[in-house]
């Protein structure tokens, strides 16, 4: 398997009892404005494949995406949550700037692909329901980085 | 094919300690999380934690904290839970299972283990 | 602290559809799990991620949800279905695997 280098957060940074709670409550806004139950982003079919050792660099790419292409563009939305949980995300994305994979990743990036593909083709809804999984995406990120 | 074998029944005395072990086979043993999961006679189902086999680490359910130690030994995929002080109500069958990511559903569950706490 | 309900008791013919609740305090975010389990014998994952369901389960078991229940329907029941049913979510915020209380489901 690919060796990862750097994929490593520390725990403190989810044992910051606010701005969880923060994250939880965007997610939980986001999700009571997302009508398409049907279809989930953060789940089997984005770990499939990927081992436990790989998820860190997984939920690295995820977090990027979701900050660049859901989070930034919809940040007038969810007020307030969203000042207080973009930049901490933000924070999280930066020290992960040097989490990378030696060897091959193309596995990976089909797996984070079809997930940009499903937000993409959702539109304004895919952002939502992205913003509604910030729960997942924040005990994701905990579970494969620390 | 893929399966969770554990180890045989135990009978134990209050203030003991227990020691289950569940071995996995058929799949990469560290790309699943193992969880505990016990049920006593005639009751429901009740999470008590899981171990990450890849790094070691552990998340006990709040009930569970300071008596129970969930580990792994990589070399033989296997997990073990120890529940120490044991007391009469912790009387029941205890299950491993495994999961994906740490909060998904359990897809494949090992055969039980009583354990019976009795003087 | 997520709580989940079932009730404690299903009776349904041969042939007929049962539908077993599984409610809980605003799981609208959540995902839910079925598991059946038989006497004597571990639990065995029916429908995840509220209607999927694992290769091996017949198509009669799906699941489905509305606000803040969540339903596993039977249809054509057999006796071989006779068993108890759980559901389960992840609480993530505490971060806890929590299941509902169960529901014995009798074949008459």
């Known amino acids: 398997a690919p060796i990862s280098s750097h994929c490593r957060l520390d725990k403190s940074n989810f044992q910051q009892p606010y701005i969880t709670n923060r994250t939880f409550m965007l997610a939980k806004e986001a999700s009571l404005a997302d009508n398409n139950t049907d279809v989930r982003l953060i789940g089997e079919k984005l770990f499939h494949g990927v081992s436990m050792s790989e998820r860190c660099y997984l939920m690295k790419q995820v977090l990027n995406f979701t900050l660049e292409e859901v989070l930034f563009p919809q940040s007038d939305r969810f007020q307030p949550y969203m000042q207080e949980v973009v930049p901490f995300l933000a924070r999280l994305s930066n020290r992960l700037s040097t989490c990378h994979i030696e060897g091959d990743d193309l596995h990976i990036q089909r797996n984070v692909q079809k997930l940009k593909d499903t937000v993409k083709k959702l539109g304004e809804s895919g952002e939502i329901k992205a913003i509604g999984e910030l729960d997942l995406l924040f005990m994701s990120l905990r579970n494969a980085c620390i | 094919q893929v399966q969770l074998v554990q180890s045989g029944a135990e009978v134990k005395k209050p203030g003991a300690s227990v020691k289950v072990s569940c071995k996995a086979s058929?799949?990469?043993?560290?790309?699943?999380?193992i969880h505990w999961v016990r049920q006593a006679p005639g009751q429901g189902l009740e999470w008590m934690g899981w171990?990450?086999?890849?790094?070691?680490?552990?998340r006990y359910a709040q009930k569970f904290q300071g008596r129970v130690t969930m580990t792994r030994d990589m070399s033989i995929s296997t997990a073990y839970m120890e529940l120490s002080r044991l007391r009469s109500d912790d009387t029941a069958v205890y299950y491993c299972a495994r999961d994906l990511t740490g909060f998904d559903p359990f897809d494949i569950w090992g055969q039980g283990t009583l354990v019976t706490v009795s003087s | 602290s997520s709580v989940l309900t079932q009730p404690p008791s299903v009776s349904v013919a041969p042939g007929k559809t049962a539908r077993i609740t599984c409610g809980g305090n605003n799981f609208r975010n959540k995902r839910v799990h079925w598991y059946q389990q038989k006497p004597g014998q571990a639990p065995v994952l029916v429908i995840y991620?509220?209607?999927d369901r694992p290769s091996g389960i017949p198509e009669r078991f799906s699941g489905s949800r509305s606000g803040n229940t969540a339903t596993l329907t039977i249809s054509r029941v057999e006796a071989g279905d006779e068993a108890d049913y759980y559901c389960?979510?992840?609480?993530?915020?505490?971060?806890?695997?929590?299941f509902g209380g169960g529901t014995k489901l009798t074949v008459l």
């Open positions: 389960q979510v992840w609480d993530l915020f505490n971060d806890n695997g929590v």
């Open positions: 058929g799949y990469t043993f560290s790309d699943y999380y």
């Open positions: 991620y509220d209607s």
């Open positions: 171990v990450n086999p890849d790094t070691g680490g552990t």
